[in-house]
Amino acid sequence: VPRWRQQWSGPGTTKRFPETVLARCVKYTEIHPEMRHVDCQSVWDAFKGAFISKHPCNITEEDYQPLMKLGTQTVPCNKILLWSRIKDLAHQFTQVQRDMFTLEDTLLGYLADDLTWCGEFNTSKINYQSCPDWRKDCSNNPVSVFWKTVSRRFAEAACDVVHVMLNGSRSKIFDKNSTFGSVEVHNLQPEKVQTLEAWVIHGGREDSRDLCQDPTIKELESIISKRNIQFSCKNIYRPDKFLQCVKNPEDSSCTSEI
């Protein structure tokens, strides 16, 4: 008789999840010499231990501490790029500007990027059928708690000028319910961070509006200012040209506004 299984509203664990995490770990540690000491089997065991046999709506940051410890990584604190709702461009940017880092350029972020996972209470099985949806089911699910934990630590590690890339095509350019708005903004350290510089990425080719004046950007400015961190905002009118100029800063067309 098939055992009754909880049906969640979200997609199930990504297929071949254990193999994917292990393979990513091996690849990352090969590419990044400073992480060569990491034992990927131990990383997978710690990852698995965070959610296997636990109710997928009752996961805590504490569950991920063994994984956090194994994945400890020193990122240059003045080279951090945060992003919200514009992941692809942020990653394209750090692929070109190699000395800057998004969360997904760190080991733990790289391991989990675009993956879903959850287990079941009291069984060692991974649930490939469904996992809790943050809105419809519960917020303390394995994926959400993981990203909250690593995002908090990443923001806490930042110093000097911190950049954030925001999507100017969205109705809420700054969304206080996003990971950036709900976690990272509140964990920047005012003693260490001088300025949060927002880069608002324009979508339309003919869009010449100053999106730094958008009400949601003013909201971000207010939150940051209350935390005694300076705020700065730039419009990136031409993201394609922006990337091109990062690649070739000597290009004569790169002196004008991007």
Epitope: E156, A157, C159, E191, K192, Q194, T195, S225, Q230, S232
Partner: antibody, heavy 114, light 111 residues
Framework: QIQLVQSGPELKKPGETVKISCKAS????????MNWVKQAPGKGLKWMGW????????TNADDFKGRFAFSLETSASTAYLQINNLKNEDMATYFC???????WGQGTLVTVSA | DIVLTQSPASLAVSLGQRTTISCRAS??????????MHWYQQKPGQPPKLLIY???NLESGIPARFSGSGSRTDFTLTINPVEADDVATYYC?????????FGSGTKLEIK
């Protein structure tokens, strides 16, 4: 290039007020906070606090609360340190330094003498 | 407040020699693998000049004769080789937590 230029030396009597200026150039003034550091004659450096040049919010170290005020004139890219009710122990060189401490003003000597 | 203890208070070094200045913090000044310790050089009548930021990073324009090392509570500034122009007072400073504090200084002279 980035420069912080401070106002000239001051000779004051005990009980008087002094206001020192620090004019910034070569960068966007509101992007970086401004620190103030005290150095008594022949002594070491003491951090007094800083002012957020974007919001104008000052943060004073405990030893510099009360008589010490940080302020701004953003349109002139200038930060100010005002010391009220001067005491003999306020005699020192005062430095402004951009947040991050890579750029410093040349210092302003405040002499307090009856 | 974090107390920084610098040693020695003064030292005399021969030209061309290697010298080290130590700075010990009363508690860790590390955060997520970054050490928030700066080193400055100050000559009489001048403002301090940033030499090393975050423990081991050489500030632009500073000669490579200067280097910094250490983590958590123990930090070292090394000058190798010492030149006549290095006569000055050297300070460490922590910026890990408010209030930012300085060491008491080390005066370097030439033998």
């Amino acid at each position: 290039q980035i420069q912080l230029v401070q106002s000239g030396p001051e000779l004051k009597k005990p009980g008087e007020t002094v206001k020192i200026s620090c004019k910034a150039s070569g960068y966007t003034f509101t992007n970086f906070g401004m620190n103030w550091v005290k150095q008594a004659p022949g002594k070491g450096l003491k951090w007094m606090g800083w002012i957020n040049t974007y919001t104008g919010e000052p943060t004073n170290a405990d030893d510099f609360k009360g008589r010490f005020a940080f302020s701004l004139e953003t349109s002139a890219s200038t930060a100010y340190l005002q010391i009220n009710n001067l005491k003999n122990e306020d005699m020192a060189t005062y430095f402004c330094a951009r947040k991050g401490f890579a750029y410093w003003g040349q210092g302003t000597l405040v002499t307090v003498s009856a | 407040d974090i107390v920084l203890t610098q040693s020695p208070a003064s030292l005399a070094v021969s030209l061309g020699q290697r010298t080290t200045i130590s700075c010990r913090a009363s508690e860790s000044v590390d955060s997520y693998g970054n050490s928030f310790m700066h080193w400055y050089q100050q000559k009489p009548g001048q403002p301090p000049k940033l030499l090393i930021y975050r423990a081991s990073n050489l500030e632009s324009g500073i000669p490579a004769r200067f280097s910094g090392s250490g983590s958590r509570t123990d930090f070292t500034l090394t000058i190798n080789p010492v030149e006549a122009d290095d006569v000055a007072t050297y300070y460490c400073q922590q910026i890990n937590e408010d209030p930012f504090t300085f060491g008491s200084g080390t005066k370097l002279e030439i033998k």
